[in-house]
C-alpha cells in the first residue's frame, strides 16, 4: 500500500481542511520546511480535500491524527457475530475455520519446503565457488577475510550449517585453526540473516506491510552486523571466544552421543528429497583442496551405496609414501604399496526429479531457484491472505495481546527474555533460524507481532541455532568432536555476547532503530531494499574479499579512509540531530552537498526511468493472476487486485478522491485507518470485469 503523501506541516485538526474544501485536487505539501530533513525522518500523513457531497463511508478512512506508521493495524472483525448465526451458518463457519487452518498449515509446510529447496538451489549455483573461497590460504592471517568469506559462503549456499560444517571439517583436518575459524563463524551468522530479508521482499506489494516486514527482517541483519563490528575487534585483540571455549572443551570429558534430533526435517524431508538431493560433501572437499571434487556434481545420483573396505595394491610416487617399508615393493618400474581402500558400490538410485536428467549443476540450480522463489512467494502471499482473514476481532485481540503485552510491573523486563527463550525453543524445534525468522517476517508484516517483540524472538533464534549446532557437535565422530564442539560454542558465546551488547539496556537496542529507519526508506523507495541486499551481502563482502587478496597494505589504504568518512558522517549526523548549534551554519544540514549525496530522490528518478517500461506489463500480469486467485478463493468479485500497481495509480489519485475499495474478507465499512492505507478508486467495470 502506498504511504500517505509526505507533508511538512500536517494539520492536527482535520475539520480545518475538510470544511472549506472547494477543489478535488490534493493539497501539495509545503516543501519549504523540508530542507533539514533526510528521507527517513519524514512522517507520512494524508491530507485530502473532500467535497461535501461525498459519502460518509469515505470519512471513516481519513485519519484524525498523525499516525505512527509503526503502530499495529487494527484488524477489526466485520463478520456476523457467532450468536447471530443460525445452525447452518455456525457449521459453515466451523468448516471454514478448519479449512483455513488446513490451508494455512499446508502453505506453511510448502513455505518451509521451498526454503529448503532454495538453499539447495543456491548450493548448486554457488556452492562450488563458495567452497573455493575456503581454500584461500590468507584466511589464517586475516580475520576480516575470514569474516567476509563466512558471509559470502553462507549467502551463496543459503545455509549457515553448511558453511559451519565445512569450517568444522577444515579445523578437524588441521587446514584451519580455531582462531581463524571464529571470524568465519561470525560471517556465517551474518549470512544466514539474508533468508528472511529475501522473504520480506515478497511483501513489497503493500507499503505499510513491507515497512514492517522489511524492518522486522533486517533487525536480524543489524544485530549481526553490529555484533561483529564490536566483537570481531575484541576477539582479534583478546581471543576471548577461543580461550573461553577451549577451557570449556578441555574441562569436560565428552563422549560423542547420539545424533541431534531432526524435528521439522522429519516432515519436510520426504517432500524435498523428491525434488532434489545434494551431496554436501563435495563443497567440503573443494574447501579442503580436493582436486577430484571440482569435477563432481553436487546432485546426488546414488542414494543407496555399499562401502567395502579392501586392501588394495596401489602405486606410490616414492618409498616415502609407503604405509610401512615391509608393505612396499616394486614391479621393477613403479613402487607399490598396500592400502586400505574403500570401494563404493552403487546399489540404488535416488528418487528425485533430476536424477536421470544429467543436467549441469548450474542448470538444476537455476531451475530450482526460480521454482522455489515462486513457491516461496506464492505460499507467503497465501499465508498472509489466510492470516488476514483469520486474525480478526477477538482472535486478533487475543493473539496480539498474548504476543505483544509485557508482564505486569515490576516484571515487565522479563518479557523480552522469555521471548528470547521462546525464539530459541522454536528454532530448536524447526532446526533452522532461517525457517523461524522467515516465518516470523510475514507476521510482523501483517501486524500480528511488533518489531519490539520480534527483536528478542530473533535473538532467541540466533541462540537456538547454536544449541542445535552444539547438539550436532556432541553427536559428531571422535576425530571432529573437539573442533566441532569448540566452534559451536564459539558461535553460542558470540551470540550471547551480542545479546548482552544490544538487548538488556533499552537504549542499546540500536538494531530496532536502524531497522525502522531502513524500513521507512524502503517503504518509500522500494528499490532501496534490493540495493541494501546487494550492497550489504554481496558488494561490501566481495570488495573486502578483493582488497584482502591484494594484501594488508591495500586493505588498510582503502579501508582507513572509508572508515574515517563513515565515522565523520555519523558524528556529524549525531551533532545535527542533538546539538546543531555547536556546528557551523553550513554543517547544520546536508544541503552543502549535491542532492544525490544526501537524498534518494534523484536516484529514485533515475531508477524509475529504467523500471518505468516494465511497470505496466507487470501490473497487468499481476491483476490477471490476482483475479484468478480471487476466483479460486471465492473472494468477492469486487476484491482489490492491484496492490502491486499502487505506484501507477498514485498518479491517478490527483484526478479523483481516493475511496476505499473493499479488501478480501472485508466489509465496506471496515475501518483500517491505523494501517494508513489510502486506496485508489476501483471503477465498477474494474470490479466486475475479469
Amino acid at each position: 500500500m502506498a504511504p500517505w503523501p509526505e507533508l511538512g506541516d500536517a494539520q492536527p485538526n482535520p475539520s480545518k481542511y475538510l470544511e472549506g474544501a472547494t477543489s478535488q485536487q490534493p493539497i501539495t505539501p509545503d516543501k519549504s520546511k523540508e530542507t533539514n530533513k533526510t528521507d527517513n525522518t519524514e512522517v507520512p500523513v494524508t491530507k485530502f480535500e473532500l467535497l461535501p457531497t461525498y459519502s460518509t463511508a469515505t470519512l471513516i478512512e481519513e485519519p484524525t491524527e498523525v499516525d505512527d506508521p509503526w503502530n499495529l493495524p487494527t484488524l477489526q472483525d466485520s463478520g456476523i457475530k457467532w450468536s447471530e448465526r443460525d445452525a447452518k451458518g455456525k457449521i459453515l463457519c466451523v468448516f471454514q475455520g478448519i479449512g483455513r487452518l488446513i490451508l494455512l498449515l499446508g502453505f506453511l509446510y510448502f513455505f518451509v519446503c521451498s526454503l529448503d529447496v532454495l538453499s539447495s538451489a543456491f548450493q548448486l549455483v554457488g556452492g562450488k565457488m563458495a567452497g573455493q573461497f575456503f581454500s584461500n590460504s590468507s584466511i589464517m592471517s586475516n580475520p576480516l577475510l575470514g569474516l567476509v568469506i563466512g558471509v559470502l559462503v553462507t549467502v551463496f549456499v543459503q545455509s549457515s550449517s553448511t558453511s559451519t560444517s565445512i569450517v568444522v571439517s577444515m579445523v578437524a583436518s588441521s587446514l584451519l585453526t580455531v582462531r581463524a575459524a571464529i571470524p568465519i563463524i561470525m560471517g556465517a551468522n551474518i549470512g544466514t540473516s539474508i533468508t528472511n530479508t529475501i522473504v520480506a521482499l515478497m511483501q513489497v506489494g503493500d507499503r505499510s506491510e513491507f515497512r514492517r516486514a522489511f524492518a522486522g527482517a533486517t533487525v536480524h541483519d543489524f544485530f549481526n552486523w553490529l555484533s561483529v563490528l564490536v566483537l570481531l575487534p575484541v576477539e582479534v585483540a583478546t581471543h576471548y571466544l577461543e580461550v573461553v571455549t577451549q577451557l570449556i572443551v578441555e574441562s569436560f570429558h565428552f563422549k560423542n552421543g547420539e545424533d541431534a534430533p531432526d524435528l521439522l526435517k522429519v516432515i519436510t524431508k520426504p517432500f524435498t528429497k523428491l525434488i532434489v538431493q545434494l551431496d554436501k560433501k563435495v563443497i567440503s572437499q573443494i574447501a579442503m583442496n580436493d582436486e577430484t571434487a571440482k569435477n563432481k556434481s553436487l546432485v546426488k545420483i546414488w542414494c543407496k551405496t555399499f562401502t567395502n573396505m579392501t586392501q588394495m595394491n596401489v602405486t606410490v610416487p616414492s618409498m616415502a609414501n609407503c604405509t610401512s617399508p615391509s608393505l612396499c615393493w616394486t614391479d621393477g618400474i613403479q613402487i607399490w604399496t598396500m592400502k586400505n581402500v574403500t570401494y563404493k558400490e552403487n546399489i540404488a538410485k535416488c528418487q528425485h526429479i533430476f536424477v536421470n536428467f544429467h543436467l549441469p549443476d548450474l542448470a538444476v540450480g537455476i531451475i530450482l531457484l526460480i521454482i522455489s522463489l515462486l513457491v516461496l512467494c506464492g505460499c507467503l502471499i497465501m499465508i498472509v491472505k489466510i492470516l488476514g482473514s483469520v486474525l480478526k476481532g477477538q482472535v486478533a485481540t487475543v493473539i496480539k495481546k498474548t504476543i505483544n503485552t509485557d508482564f505486569p510491573f515490576p516484571f515487565a523486563w522479563l518479557t523480552g527474555y522469555l521471548a528470547i527463550l521462546v525464539g530459541a525453543g522454536m528454532t530448536f524445534i524447526v532446526q533452522s533460524s532461517s525457517v523461524f525468522t522467515s516465518a516470523l517476517t510475514p507476521l510482523i508484516g501483517i501486524g500480528v507481532i511488533t518489531i519490539e517483540r520480534a527483536y528478542p524472538l530473533t535473538l532467541g533464534s540466533n541462540i537456538g541455532t547454536t544449541t542445535t549446532a552444539i547438539l550436532a557437535a556432541l553427536a559428531s565422530p571422535g576425530n571432529t568432536l573437539r573442533s566441532s564442539l569448540q566452534i559451536a560454542l564459539c558461535h553460542f558465546f558470540f551470540n550471547i555476547s551480542g545479546i548482552l551488547l544490544w538487548y538488556p539496556i533499552p537504549f542499546t537496542r540500536l538494531p530496532i532503530r536502524m531497522a525502522k529507519g531502513l524500513g521507512n526508506i524502503s517503504a518509500k523507495y522500494r528499490w532501496f531494499a534490493i540495493f541494501y541486499l546487494i550492497i550489504f551481502f554481496f558488494l561490501i563482502p566481495l570488495t573486502v574479499f578483493g582488497l584482502s587478496l591484494a594484501g594488508w597494505p591495500v586493505l588498510v589504504g582503502v579501508g582507513v579512509p572509508v572508515v574515517f568518512i563513515i565515522i565523520l558522517v555519523l558524528c556529524l549526523r549525531l551533532l545535527q540531530s542533538r546539538c546543531p548549534r555547536v556546528l557551523p551554519k553550513k554543517l547544520q544540514n546536508w544541503n552543502f552537498l549535491p542532492l544525490c549525496m544526501h537524498s534518494l530522490k534523484p536516484w529514485d528518478a533515475v531508477i524509475s526511468k529504467f523500471t518505468g517500461p516494465f511497470q505496466m506489463p507487470c501490473c497487468c500480469c499481476c491483476r490477471v493472476c490476482c483475479r484468478v486467485c480471487c476466483l479460486l478463493c471465492g473472494c468477492p468479485k469486487c476484491c482489490r487486485c492491484s496492490k502491486c500497481c499502487q505506484d501507477l495509480e498514485e498518479g491517478q489519485e490527483a484526478q479523483g478522491v481516493p475511496v476505499k475499495a473493499p479488501e478480501t474478507f472485508d466489509n465496506i465499512t471496515i475501518s483500517r485507518e491505523a494501517q494508513g492505507e489510502v486506496r485508489a478508486p476501483d471503477s465498477k467495470t474494474e470490479c466486475t470485469a475479469l
Epitope: N313, P325, W329, T330, D331, I333, Q334, W336
Partner: antibody, heavy 119, light 107 residues
Framework: QVQLVQSGAEVKKPGASVKVSCKTS????????MHWVRQAPGQGLEWIGA????????AYNQKFKGRVTMTADTSTSTVYMELSSLRSEDTAVYYC????????????WGQGTLVTVSS | DIQLTQSPSFLSASVGDRVTITCKAS??????VAWYQQKPGKSPKLLIY???TRHSGVPDRFSGSGSGTEFTFTISSLQPEDFATYFC?????????FGQGTKLEIK
C-alpha cells in the same frame, strides 16, 4: 598361451652394441612389464632393467645405466634391449621375462639369447 | 642394493626327501620374495611369489614361508624332476636382485 620368443645368438666385438628382441603373444602386451635378466656362464641371475610397454616407461639397474636402452613396439608386441659398449664380461645368456601385474615376480620367460663378446 | 644370500649353495638329497633352502635378505623386504627353478640349458620357471603363494600349475609339494629378512623354500617330498638349481629373488626395491642359487643334486 603366453609365449616369449627371443632373437638368435649374437657374437660381438668389445665396444660394439647388441640389440636383442623378444616377441610376445598370448596376452595383452601393454598390461605387463617386461624384464631383462642375464646369466653369465655358471653364474647367478642378474636383473638389467624393465620396460612398461603401455607407456614406454623404463627402469634400469644402476650398473647398466648409460649402456642399456629398452624399447617396445606395440604394433608387433615386441620388446628390444640394446646394450652398448660391450665388454668381455657382458658374455651371458640374456632373458626377457614377463612381470606379473603389480609386483616384480616374473612368471613367463623367453628361451634366452646367448651374446658372446670376444675380440 | 639388497643382497640375498642363499644357503646351502649345494645340496644332495634322495627322492622322497624333505628339502629346505633358506634365503637371507640384507634388509627387510616384507614378503616381496619369489622362488624360481632352473634346469640346465633352460629358462628359469616361477614357483612361488609373495613368499608363500604358489604359481599356477606348481605342485603343492613346493612351499614357501617367512617374512622380513628370513625366507625358506621347502620341497616336502623330492621327485626325480625336482633336481635343478633354485633361486630366490626380492622385489621389495630396485634393483631387483637374485640369490646366488642352490644346486640340488641327486645323492
Amino acid at each position: 598361451q603366453v609365449q616369449l620368443v627371443q632373437s638368435g645368438a649374437e657374437v660381438k666385438k668389445p665396444g660394439a652394441s647388441v640389440k636383442v628382441s623378444c616377441k610376445t603373444s598370448g596376452y595383452t602386451f601393454t598390461t605387463n612389464n617386461m624384464h631383462w635378466v642375464r646369466q653369465a656362464p655358471g653364474q647367478g641371475l642378474e636383473w638389467i632393467g624393465a620396460i612398461y610397454p603401455g607407456s614406454g616407461a623404463t627402469a634400469y639397474n644402476q650398473k647398466f645405466k648409460g649402456r642399456v636402452t629398452m624399447t617396445a613396439d606395440t604394433s608387433t608386441s615386441t620388446v628390444y634391449m640394446e646394450l652398448s659398449s660391450l665388454r668381455s664380461e657382458d658374455t651371458a645368456v640374456y632373458y626377457c621375462a614377463r612381470g606379473m601385474y603389480g609386483h616384480g615376480a616374473m612368471d613367463y620367460w623367453g628361451q634366452g639369447t646367448l651374446v658372446t663378446v670376444s675380440s | 642394493d639388497i643382497q640375498l644370500t642363499q644357503s646351502p649353495s649345494f645340496l644332495s638329497a634322495s627322492v622322497g626327501d624333505r628339502v629346505t633352502i633358506t634365503c637371507k635378505a640384507s634388509q627387510d623386504v616384507g614378503t616381496a620374495v619369489a622362488w624360481y627353478q632352473q634346469k640346465p640349458g633352460k629358462s628359469p620357471k616361477l614357483l612361488i611369489y609373495w613368499a608363500t603363494t604358489r604359481h599356477s600349475g606348481v605342485p603343492d609339494r613346493f612351499s614357501g614361508s617367512g617374512s622380513g629378512t628370513e625366507f625358506t623354500f621347502t620341497i616336502s617330498s623330492l621327485q626325480p624332476e625336482d633336481f635343478a638349481t633354485y633361486f630366490c629373488q626380492q622385489y621389495s626395491s630396485n634393483p631387483l636382485t637374485f640369490g646366488q642359487g642352490t644346486k640340488l643334486e641327486i645323492k
